[in-house]
């Protein structure tokens, strides 16, 4: 994670002004995966490469954002750039985030992740939800998901909404939530680990 954001930025910054304009126009009509919204036209057209990179990551997350960017570049006839973007993205995807133990391979991996095992307790007991959202924003939460969780009136309903997105997460995404929990409410994590 995170590697893709750098790769998208390098790709977009390497477009001329004319190419960037063309990229934005194509982005308005490119087919999107189900469940993903389109960046509003007004905002999109005024963005520079750096803002557009961050918008792509917040709307589509890193992996799909990079894939989408590569598709548009390919559609523009920039096959080499698209290939370089995908190569750069995959080059960094093998490493687990620092400080997070890479999960054992599937045969040895326990069936449930910590956050799934303790879902009910986390919904009931997490109080620092805003902090978690900031830690996960743009990495595993899209802009829309972030806003949806924040809109909930209580901490338990916020956590319930957050958990509604976790079925689509992989082990590393769940590790990021666990790491954020360790940093914001370590006593709670320790208590649950002992239980």
């Amino acid at each position: 994670m995170g590697r893709a954001r750098d790769a998208i930025l390098d790709a977009l910054e390497n477009l001329t002004a004319e190419e960037l304009k063309k990229f934005k126009l194509k982005l308005l009509s490119v087919p999107l995966r189900e469940g993903y919204g389109r960046i509003p036209r007004g905002a999109l057209l005024s963005m520079d490469a750096l803002d557009l990179t961050d918008k792509l990551v917040s709307f589509y997350l890193e992996t799909y954002g990079a894939e989408l960017t590569a598709n548009v570049l390919r559609d523009m006839g920039l096959q080499e750039m698209a290939g370089q973007l995908q190569a750069a993205t995959h080059q960094g995807s093998g490493a687990a985030p620092a400080g997070i133990q890479a999960p054992p391979q599937s045969a040895a991996k326990p069936g449930l992740h910590f956050i799934d095992q303790h879902r009910a307790a986390l919904i009931a007991r997490v109080t620092n939800v805003e902090w978690l959202l900031d830690a996960l924003y743009g990495k595993v939460l899209t802009d829309e998901q972030y806003q949806a969780v924040r809109a909930e009136p209580t901490n338990p309903s916020k956590m319930r909404k957050l958990f509604s997105f976790t079925p689509a997460w992989n082990w590393t995404c769940k590790d990021l939530l666990l790491q954020a929990l360790r940093e914001s409410q370590s006593y709670l994590v320790e208590d649950l680990e002992r239980s």
């Epitope: 390098d10 390497n14 961050d54 080499e80």
Partner: antibody, heavy 112, light 106 residues
Framework: QVQLQQSGAELARPGASVKLSCKAS????????ISWVKQRTGQGLEWIGK????????YYDEKFKGKATLTADKPSTTAYMELRSLTSEDSAVYFC?????WGQGTTLTVSS | QIVLTQSPVIMSASPGEKVTITCSAS?????MYWFQQKPGTSPKFWIY???NLASGVPARFSGSGSGTSYSLTISRMEAEDAATYYC?????????FGGGTKLEIK
């Protein structure tokens, strides 16, 4: 393996200009932006600016606008930084860097 | 521009000790990058995108944080970790570095 080979040490007079080079090999030159970083003896790192060789897009820290000019030559896969109106404050080691890799640095000494 | 403030500026740690270096940003950034530099050498790319170790970096290093507060942690200090560490933000131009933290071995 990406490599950035920087030009040798430079000695220049106050008021003069100097052009430092950074030759890239081991990757597609136009894939990444190339940043330039200044480090005075015993001091920290200062980001000067960045150039994207394919598009020619450049970004500078305001502090270095008018002092540094970044260019890139695609055929020779070399990035350049020209520093003008040199003063003793410009004496430093200058590094070029891509996303993950750094050159060995070029020492610039400005002295009369 | 975004100003990064590192603390402490200088510190020493004994072998086996846990070390934490912090980097505070004047406004929110999406990721933090860390570099290690030893005297007379070029900086080395150390941690990217807040929490990912660059190739060849020992697993005792970790990175974390979000918003305006980030940190680099060494779980057990070793002699070879003595160096100066710099944080860098790439969220807004101009990209900026922290002032550095010099880590010495006791």
């Amino acid at each position: 393996q990406v490599q950035l080979q920087q030009s040798g040490a430079e000695l220049a007079r106050p008021g003069a200009s100097v052009k430092l080079s950074c030759k890239a090999s081991g990757h597609t030159f136009t894939s990444y932006g190339i940043s330039w970083v200044k480090q005075r003896t015993g001091q920290g790192l200062e980001w000067i600016g960045k150039i994207y060789p394919r598009s020619g897009n450049t970004y500078y820290d305001e502090k270095f606008k008018g002092k540094a000019t970044l260019t890139a030559d695609k055929p020779s896969t070399t990035a350049y930084m020209e520093l003008r109106s040199l003063t003793s404050e410009d004496s430093a080691v200058y590094f070029c860097a891509t996303r993950d890799y750094w050159g060995q640095g070029t020492t610039l000494t400005v002295s009369s | 521009q975004i100003v990064l403030t590192q603390s402490p500026v200088i510190m020493s740690a004994s072998p086996g000790e846990k070390v934490t270096i912090t980097c505070s940003a004047s406004s929110s950034v999406s990721y933090m990058y860390w570099f290690q530099q030893k005297p007379g050498t070029s900086p080395k790319f150390w941690i990217y995108s807040t929490s990912n170790l660059a190739s060849g970096v020992p697993a005792r290093f970790s990175g974390s944080g979000s918003g305006t507060s980030y940190s680099l942690t060494i779980s057990r200090m070793e002699a070879e970790d003595a160096a100066t560490y710099y944080c860098q933000q790439r969220s807004r131009y101009p990209w900026t570095f922290g002032g550095g933290t010099k880590l010495e071995i006791k």
